[in-house]
Interface confidence: low
């Protein structure tokens, strides 16, 4: 049966006994700035190109052992959510991965900046179709990271980021607080904001919309055919990156403003239980859960 | 991580001691009425003191960025400080990433073309 998260983002007009979403996103390249990935996983094999970009801090602790499957875990799962053969949103999208997070899932603002610069330079050297950049990471508010995101967005790149898993105002974090970035919070199968231990999804006016982010089935780096369930605003952001890729593939000339408008337009409205949010944040937090456009307007590429 | 350590870690073999250059004496004064600002992460445990992103004004060319970085190294060297330019930015934002002592911030903020300086900080998978 179709995983709950894919069903949630799929409008009724797609639905049949079997989940067969359009093979969308084929005109779009999605850049993933995350951990290293297992590019030969069957979910993403041939769909993800690992760039030679790597800018990560050393792992903390003298006893830390780099285990490939652990190092690749976060990025592999997200690549699968975006474009995985079985459990991906935009099955036609091609991806490029940049390593900006170490085996502990930690990176730096400077490393992320250099990664964004790498993307811009790649875009200038070899202009392709629409670009989506997925930033499934968060740090404290950073003027320079927000500024770099703004510049990249003004160059026509769509940036999608995690709202953060701190059960806090997303405006206190970057790149979530960057106005030009599409910032995504996480909801679960019950349309509740996701709780993660004692924390949970961020909220507030810097969040653009929510997407499935709890118990998301995706590629596991434990083996080339393994699947695992992961939760977080990264997973939510990956759904929106996939939806954006499909929309941009359908209409490559969409501006960021139009894309944002359409993401909001096709979202399920007023389904999130707002009682989870602090009272003063309820009116500021968008009650929107991302969804694909009806298939009438999906642009399919049969190659 | 290593990139975010203070210079006191003894890792001097990597660092280049910038010699005083001729152009050090030709430092332009910062534009009148503009003051560069310093920013750092509000979440203390996530701060990475010792590494700084020096952001230059929008229209600054790569050659000016490189020149400003060299000037910083030269002026720091005169004061007995080691610095290392880790990356020169161009394409998105003009500027450079420098590994240096926080003692040099005041000096760096007065360099020509500087818009603001931000201390590096951690980001995390979500």
């Amino acid at each position: 049966s179709i995983p709950w998260n894919l069903e949630r983002i799929t409008p009724p007009r797609y639905r049949a006994d079997e989940y067969q979403p359009p093979d969308g996103g084929s005109l779009v390249e999605v850049y993933l700035l995350d951990t290293s990935i297992q590019s030969d996983h069957r979910e993403i094999e041939g769909r993800v190109m690992v760039t030679d970009f790597e800018n990560v801090p050393e792992e903390d602790g003298t006893r830390f052992h780099r285990q490939a499957s652990k190092c690749d875990s976060h990025g592999t799962h997200l690549a699968g959510v975006v474009s995985g053969r079985d459990a991906g949103v935009a099955k036609g999208a091609s991806m490029r991965s940049l390593r900006v997070l170490n085996c502990q899932g930690k990176g730096t603002v400077s490393g992320t900046l250099i990664g964004l610069e790498f993307i811009r330079k790649s875009q200038l050297v070899q202009p392709v179709g629409p670009l989506v950049v997925l930033l499934p990471l968060a740090g404290g508010y950073s003027r320079v990271l927000n500024a770099a995101c703004q510049r990249l967005a003004r160059a026509g790149v769509v940036l999608v980021t995690a709202a953060g898993n701190f059960r806090d105002d997303a405006c206190l974090y970057s790149p979530a607080s960057a106005p030009e970035v599409i910032t995504v919070g996480a909801t679960n199968a019950q349309d509740q904001p996701v709780t993660l231990g004692t924390l949970g999804t961020n909220f507030g006016r810097c969040v653009d919309l929510f997407a499935p982010g709890e118990d998301i089935i995706g590629a596991s780096s434990d083996c080339s055919t393994c699947f695992v369930s992961q939760s977080g605003t990264s997973q939510a952001a990956a759904h929106v990156a996939g939806i954006a890729a499909m929309m941009l593939s359908a209409e490559p000339e969409l501006t960021l403003a139009e894309l944002r408008q359409r993401l909001i337009h096709f979202s399920a409205k007023d389904v999130i239980n707002e009682a989870w949010f602090p009272e003063d944040q309820r009116v500021l937090t968008p009650n929107l859960v991302a969804a694909l456009p009806p298939s009438t307007h999906e642009n399919l590429y049969f190659q | 991580g290593a990139m975010g350590q203070e210079d006191e870690d003894g890792d001097y073999e990597e660092l280049v001691l910038a010699l005083r250059s001729e152009e050090d004496g030709l430092a332009e004064a910062p534009e009148h009425g503009t003051t560069a600002t310093f920013h750092r992460c509000a979440k203390d445990p996530w701060r990475l003191p010792g590494t700084y992103v020096v952001v230059l004004k929008e229209e600054t060319h790569l050659s000016q960025s490189e020149r400003t970085a060299r000037r910083l190294q030269a002026q720091a060297a005169r004061r007995g400080y080691l610095t290392k330019i880790l990356h020169v930015f161009h394409g998105l934002l003009p500027g450079f990433l420098v590994k240096m002592s926080g003692d040099l911030l005041e000096l760096a903020l007065k360099l020509p073309h500087v818009d603001y300086i931000e201390e590096d900080s951690s980001v995390f998978a979500q």
Partner: antibody, heavy 119, light 109 residues
Framework: EVQLVESGGGLVQPGGSLRLSCAAS????????MSWVRQAPGKGLEWVAN????????YYVDSVKGRFTISRDNAKNSLYLQMNSLRAEDTAVYSC????????????WGQGTMVTVSS | QSVLTQPPSASGTPGQRVTISCSGS????????VNWYQQFPGTAPKLLIY???RRPSGVPDRFSGSKSGTSASLAISGLQSEDEADYYC??????????FGAGTKLTVL
């Protein structure tokens, strides 16, 4: 320039059949849902049917279900409407339209072909 | 009987602002975007407004659309004689049909 040109209209007796064609040019035809919209003389617009990019999904207005069949040939950049058991109330100008891939809209229209059902 | 309800006619003098309404239900306008088409006699309709309020390129900014609940409206400001035409609203419906209004004939007095 994107163009849709309809053909195949004409005068037919009630109960008769017609096959309308629409030739598309200037667009990647296989990327779009396509529709037929009709307009009876002096009346408003009425959507008739539409078809998915690969032909795997088709929808019809209730009044033509079981009588009309929409189809397409992507290799020929062509859209068709097979009309059987025609009735007087099917008399209209039939236009082929492209459904935009965004925004729920018919963004390109053909000039239409007239179908008259009369004895 | 059209699924969407429009006034059969509307009129205004040059320079005036004219509004045409379109009423539907939760299965169409209430949950979908609305489009407006302009049709001159003997010609094919032209997309005027899509996604409630967006103008395709080439459509003057005198034309604007809005939606509230299960109703939508088309406003034409600075009315000009060349705006005399038929105007249709349309939306996708949960019944898996496109639905149109019966059309409004705009007369410029």
């Amino acid at each position: 320039e994107v163009q849709l040109v309809e053909s195949g209209g004409g005068l037919v007796q009630p109960g008769g059949s017609l096959r309308l064609s629409c030739a598309a040019s200037g667009l990647t035809f296989s990327n779009f849902w396509m529709s037929w919209v009709r307009q009876a003389p002096g009346k408003g617009l009425e959507w008739v049917a539409n078809i998915k990019q690969d032909g795997s999904e088709k929808y019809y207005v209730d009044s033509v279900k079981g009588r009309f069949t929409i189809s397409r040939d992507n290799a020929k950049n062509s859209l068709y409407l097979q009309m059987n058991s025609l009735r007087a109330e099917d008399t209209a100008v039939y236009s082929c339209t492209r459904e935009s891939n965004w925004g729920f809209a018919f963004d390109i229209w053909g000039q239409g072909t007239m179908v008259t059902v009369s004895s | 009987q059209s699924v969407l309800t429009q006034p059969p006619s509307a009129s205004g003098t040059p320079g005036q602002r004219v509004t045409i309404s379109c009423s539907g239900s939760s299965s169409n306008i209430g949950s979908k975007t609305v489009n407006w088409y302009q049709q001159f006699p003997g010609t094919a309709p032209k997309l005027l407004i899509y996604s409630n309020n967006r103008r395709p390129s080439g459509v003057p900014d005198r034309f604007s659309g809005s939606k509230s609940g299960t109703s939508a409206s088309l406003a034409i400001s600075g009315l000009q004689s060349e705006d005399e035409a038929d105007y249709y609203c349309a939306a996708w419906d949960d019944s898996l049909n496109w639905v149109f209004g019966a059309g409004t004939k705009l007369t410029v007095l």
